[in-house]
């Protein structure tokens, strides 16, 4: 049975140009994790892997950091950036756990106007 | 669809370095899901896991090889590399390329393979 | 490192009968992380299942994998004459490394 639960920022914002964390974290369950999956819509951003650890993704490795812990940093923001990210946790015996995050990447002058960070 | 072919030496001399590429076609080694290994079968026995490598340059190797074995990346050429040093004849084996799914976790295996090249071991 | 036995060593059985394959851990291996390879004289091996039970692309649905824990079985319902070959089982873990079995031998009756 799955009793865990993924605990996320939410809707978030950010100016382009900029960076932001994303971040999961995964409570109420004493499974094993073996790995973190971080995707937006159906791309492959980045990999955590229990044993092997960080692992970005071809078309993201210049912009995109591991960590911190097992959240992600993404930089030199753009407006495509906007959507949703997805952490995937897979966990043992437990199986998978998903995560989704919103972000809105707003041109500087409205970005400063808003709130940065915005959890529903 | 994406092919694997293993290139070297088909004769090393004991205590020399075998070294073989592995030559990726039909898509790119730049996968972010994928490592790409190396396996061995000596003649007539079983297979055996040599090391893998991520296009990045991360690697993880049998335990029992690692001390003399080192496996490189080059993503300008779609190829990744195994040396192995201080043969002797128990080398003697069909070396394979593969592409190894470690990450892909619920499908963990090695999906698709070289044909193999046979490496002797002698003086 | 985590020892893959499998049984019966050779197999002698006729086209149409049905194969079943054994393959034992010396620990507990996540049946998301085994695998099931058939190779034939001068090839390279090939993935017929993985994840203990789904069918790699291409495979015929008599190949059929089941099992968890240390106990693991590869079955093929009827044998067709392009199925005689050696057949392993591997174990993907990372620590301790990944492993093959020693194999099992399908030949003709």
């Known amino acids: 049975m799955m009793t865990g639960t993924i605990e996320t920022t939410g809707n978030i914002s950010a100016e382009k140009g900029g960076s932001i964390i994303l971040q999961c974290h995964l409570s109420s369950t004493t499974a094993q994790v073996t790995q973190v999956n971080w995707e937006q819509q159906d791309q492959l951003l980045a990999i955590c892997n229990a044993d092997l650890g960080w692992h970005i993704s071809p078309s993201f490795k210049d912009r995109v950091a591991p960590g911190p812990g097992l959240g992600l940093t993404l930089q030199s923001l753009t407006v495509n950036d906007t959507g949703e990210y997805f952490c995937i946790y897979h966990t043992y015996p437990d199986g998978t756990y998903t995560g989704r995050i919103f972000l809105e990447v707003l041109e500087s002058s409205v970005a400063e106007h808003g709130a940065r960070f915005q959890i529903p | 669809q994406l092919q694997l072919q293993e290139s070297g030496p088909g004769l090393v001399k004991p205590s020399e370095t075998l070294s073989l590429t592995c030559t990726v076609s039909g898509g790119s080694i730049e996968s972010g899901s994928y490592y790409w290994g190396w396996i061995r079968q000596p003649p007539g026995k079983g297979l055996e896991w040599i090391g893998s490598i991520y296009y990045s340059g991360g690697t993880y190797y049998n335990p029992s090889l690692k001390s003399r074995v080192t496996i490189s990346v080059d993503t300008s050429k779609n190829q990744f590399s195994l040396k192995l040093s201080s043969v002797t004849a128990a080398d003697t084996a069909v070396y394979y390329c593969?592409?190894?799914?470690?990450?892909?976790?619920?499908?963990?295996?090695?999906?698709?393979w070289g044909q193999g090249t046979m490496v002797t071991v002698s003086s | 490192e985590i020892v893959l036995t499998q049984s019966p060593g050779t197999l002698s059985l006729s086209p149409g009968e049905r194969a079943t394959l054994s393959c034992r851990a010396s620990q507990s291996v996540s049946s998301s992380y085994l695998a099931w390879y058939q190779q034939k004289p001068g090839q390279a091996p090939r993935l017929l299942i993985y994840?203990?039970?789904s069918r790699a692309t291409g495979i015929p649905d008599r190949f059929s994998g089941s099992g968890s824990g240390t106990d693991f079985t590869l079955t093929i319902s009827r044998l067709e004459p392009e199925d005689f070959a050696v057949y392993y089982c591997?174990?993907?873990?990372?620590?301790?490394?990944?492993?093959f079995g020693g194999g099992t031998k399908v030949e003709i009756k």
């Open positions: 591997q174990q993907h873990t990372v620590r301790p490394p990944l492993t």
């Open positions: 994840g203990a039970s």
């Open positions: 593969a592409r190894d799914g470690v990450l892909t976790l619920n499908k963990r295996s090695f999906d698709i």
